[in-house]
Every structure is written in structure tokens, then in C-alpha cells.
């Protein structure tokens, strides 16, 4: 019997990505999100 | 395009302190962040703290947060790193970084110029 095993080749990594409100707006702060897998999630 | 020449770099005892500072020329310096990244030898070149175009945010690497201050004088075209309380792990080439609006600060591909570098060279 031939045996097969699911795997996607890669990792899918994840990187904090930080803005600054001030740079597309007045207001001050910053914002955090995430990117998982070159998309940016949160 | 804006040119960025640091200084400020050398070498000090654990414990001490440096000031860097980073001189812009060419385009309107209020129009860019800025950034501090640094790079030890065999690692990437690792974040280390942004600020905004009017100053009025920063944001720090955890590691250096509590140690270093980033601020900007626009008069002078000029941005500055505080750091104090310094490590033998801080030991790097730090380079100054102009970013445009709308980009992530904590990353270096968002930075599209770049000083040459000033070498931190911190011993225990």
C-alpha cells in the first residue's frame, strides 16, 4: 500500500509589521498588525 | 532622494552611553521618517527604533526600549539615537534610514535610503 503524507513544501511565516497613524492622518500612536504569509491579517 | 551621513559611533565600556546622529541633505527631510537599524557581524541587519516625520511618534525594538531614545530636529535636517545603558550585545554598524509615508516602520524593505553606517562597539 502506498503511503502519502500532506505537506506543503514551505513554511508560512508570520512578522509584526508597526505604522504610524501619523503618517496617514493627524492622529498620533502606533498600529500593529500582522503579516502571515505575505498577507497582512491584524 | 536624500543622502544620510551618520556619526557618532565608537567604542565604550558596558554601562556607558553614545549618541549617534544622522545629518540628511537633498530632499525635504520633514517629508520622511526615519529609522535606526543595526547590524552585527554574521546576523542581519535588525530594527532598532522609527520615528515619525514630525517626531511625534516613535517606536522602539523591544531589547533597546528603556535604553535608547530616537528624536529628530527638522531645523537641522538631522535625527538622533540616544543610547544608554549599553550591552556588549549591542555591539553593531548602526545606520540611519529615510522611509516615505505609508509604510511599515519596523522593517527595512520600507526604507529606500540608507547612510553608510557608523560602527558601536561595545566592550565588557
Known amino acids: 500500500d502506498a503511503e502519502f503524507r500532506h505537506d506543503s513544501g514551505y513554511e508560512v511565516h508570520h512578522q509584526k509589521l508597526v505604522f504610524f497613524a501619523e503618517d496617514v492622518g493627524s492622529n498620533k500612536g502606533a498600529i500593529i498588525g500582522l503579516m502571515v504569509g505575505g498577507v497582512v491579517i491584524a | 532622494e536624500v543622502q544620510l551621513v551618520e556619526s557618532g559611533g565608537g567604542l565604550v565600556q558596558a554601562g556607558g552611553s553614545l549618541r549617534l546622529s544622522c545629518v540628511a541633505s537633498g530632499r525635504t527631510f520633514s517629508n520622511y521618517g526615519m529609522g535606526w537599524f543595526r547590524q552585527a557581524p554574521g546576523k542581519d541587519r535588525e530594527f532598532v527604533a522609527a520615528?515619525?516625520?514630525?517626531?511625534?511618534?516613535?517606536y522602539y525594538e523591544d531589547d533597546v526600549k528603556g535604553r535608547f531614545t530616537i528624536s529628530r530636529d527638522n531645523a537641522k535636517n538631522s535625527v538622533y539615537l540616544q543610547m544608554n545603558s549599553l550591552k556588549p550585545e549591542d555591539t553593531a554598524v548602526y545606520y540611519c534610514?529615510?522611509?516615505?509615508?505609508?509604510?511599515?516602520?519596523?522593517?527595512?524593505?520600507?526604507?529606500?535610503?540608507w547612510g553608510q553606517g557608523t560602527q558601536v562597539t561595545v566592550s565588557s
Open positions: 520615528i515619525s516625520r514630525s517626531g511625534g511618534t516613535t
Open positions: 534610514a529615510a522611509r516615505p509615508s505609508y509604510v511599515a516602520v519596523n522593517i527595512a524593505a520600507s526604507y529606500n535610503n
